[in-house]
């Protein structure tokens, strides 16, 4: 905290300039008008202000405006924004896409640090929705945006958003966001034709169900062992031999280095030995010959 | 214990260059604005050069704007100063300076290299 001191005679800032590098913190304090500095926001960051003349810079901000600060004078913050906390930011409205992308640039490179995750919460809440644009921008920054948000949040992501997905935005996604992102993907990509419909969906698949994977096995897509084995095992249980051979296409040769991997180990347990044999891959595990298999799931459901 | 290293000084004719070096160890100087000042003989010592903690901001005393030219490197934590179109002038020991807290008293020094410019 800054001591209350008078301006030295002649000190007073007419304007933010250079010059006031060479001020003392105390000076910086008496003689710079908190009003003038919101005013002229855009200057500070082409100035080198130290690391501790710019908590003196936000000293004042803060005062002036004890509720938040406007949207004006958040815009050009610059660096001084890394000196916010979560608790000053949670006072702010930011409703700006500019804005968003002025502050998110000031922390590029850096890990998304708890500043930017509570001025992102702040942007999508107040925005309703985390609609195309936005979400353009969020994952240009921070490519694992997406798979951060609870399925509660991803809820609010229109499919019209989807377009703006890359695959490597789901790297991180786990199968309950998935779950959530399938349905829009598979909304979104709707009038797509088959091998195009196949390219944009192929990201998502890890939430879908048996019914969309049995039709796609039908479309000659030749899914690789990698978006295979992101496939959710209860939906790749009820697949059969054919189907998920169709599925894979040629690929199908790289079940067998996955054998002892979910979700393969747990169909392959599934299947019936002599219809493994008919990949000649010579997978091991399926039911003997002259078993009978009784579903009692199904049982269940019927009594 | 903080130490800042300068190098590159020398003896120079008129209109030539130099390119001076500080070398920052002790600690990380990530959050430290760095500078160089000169001290002529008989004279106080003045900022010549000024370089932001972050975003590579700057700053040049009028007598030096568009010869000089500061940088730093922050994964070597090192600062340099570009010297061009050199001027008797601009004969002087230069310093090397780091601080967090204000350029009036800045929180760490160098011990100096000689510049001399001759005509």
């Known amino acids: 905290e800054v001591e209350k001191t008078a301006c030295p005679s002649g000190k007073k800032a007419r304007e933010i300039d250079e010059s006031l590098i060479f001020y003392k913190k105390w000076e910086l304090e008496a003689c710079v008008d908190a009003a003038l500095l919101a005013t002229q926001m855009d200057r500070v960051n082409a100035i080198p202000f130290t690391y501790e003349q710019l908590d003196v810079l936000k000293h004042k901000l803060d005062e002036l405006y004890p509720q938040g600060y406007p949207e004006s004078v958040i815009q050009h913050l610059g660096y001084l924004f890394l000196k916010m906390s979560p608790e000053d930011i949670r006072k702010w409205n930011v409703t700006s896409l500019e804005t968003l992308k002025a502050l998110l640039e000031v922390n590029k490179g850096h890990e998304m640090s708890p500043q930017v995750a509570t001025l992102i919460d702040r942007f999508v809440k107040g925005r309703g929705q985390l609609d195309k644009d936005t979400l353009d921008t969020l994952t240009a920054f921070y490519p694992g945006y997406l798979c951060s948000l609870s399925p509660e949040e991803l809820s609010s992501v229109p499919p019209s958003s989807i377009w703006a997905v890359r695959p490597q935005d789901l790297d991180t996604c786990d199968p309950r966001q998935l779950d959530v992102l399938y349905p829009k993907a598979r909304l979104a990509f709707q009038n797509m034709n088959g091998s195009e419909y196949f390219v944009k969906i192929q990201s998502f698949l890890g939430g879908a169900p048996t019914e969309d994977l049995k039709a796609l096995s039908q479309q000659n897509v030749s899914m690789d062992l990698a978006t295979f084995m992101k496939l959710r095992t209860d939906a790749v249980l009820p697949l059969t031999v054919a189907e998920v051979q169709k599925l894979l296409g040629p690929h199908v040769e790289g079940l067998k280095a996955e054998e002892r991997h979910r979700p393969v180990r747990d169909w392959i347990l599934r299947q019936r030995q002599d219809d493994l044999d008919t990949l000649g891959l010579g997978l091991q595990g399926g039911i003997p010959n002259g078993y009978l298999v009784l579903d009692l799931s199904m049982q269940e459901a019927l009594s | 214990q903080v130490q800042l290293v300068e190098s590159g000084g020398g003896l120079v004719p008129a209109g030539g260059s130099l390119r001076l070096s500080c070398a920052a160890s002790g600690r990380t100087f990530s959050t430290y604005s760095m500078g160089w000042f000169r001290q002529a003989p008989g004279k106080e010592r003045e900022p010549v050069a000024v370089?932001?903690?972050?975003?590579?901001?700057?700053y040049y005393a009028d007598s030096v704007k568009g010869r000089f030219t500061i940088s730093r490197d922050y994964a070597k934590n090192t600062l340099y100063l570009q010297m061009n179109s050199l001027k008797p002038a601009d004969t002087a020991v230069y310093y090397c300076a780091a601080t967090k807290s204000e350029w009036r008293d800045p929180d760490y020094w160098g011990q100096g290299t000689q510049v001399t410019v001759s005509s």
């Open positions: 370089i932001s903690w972050i975003g590579g901001s700057t």
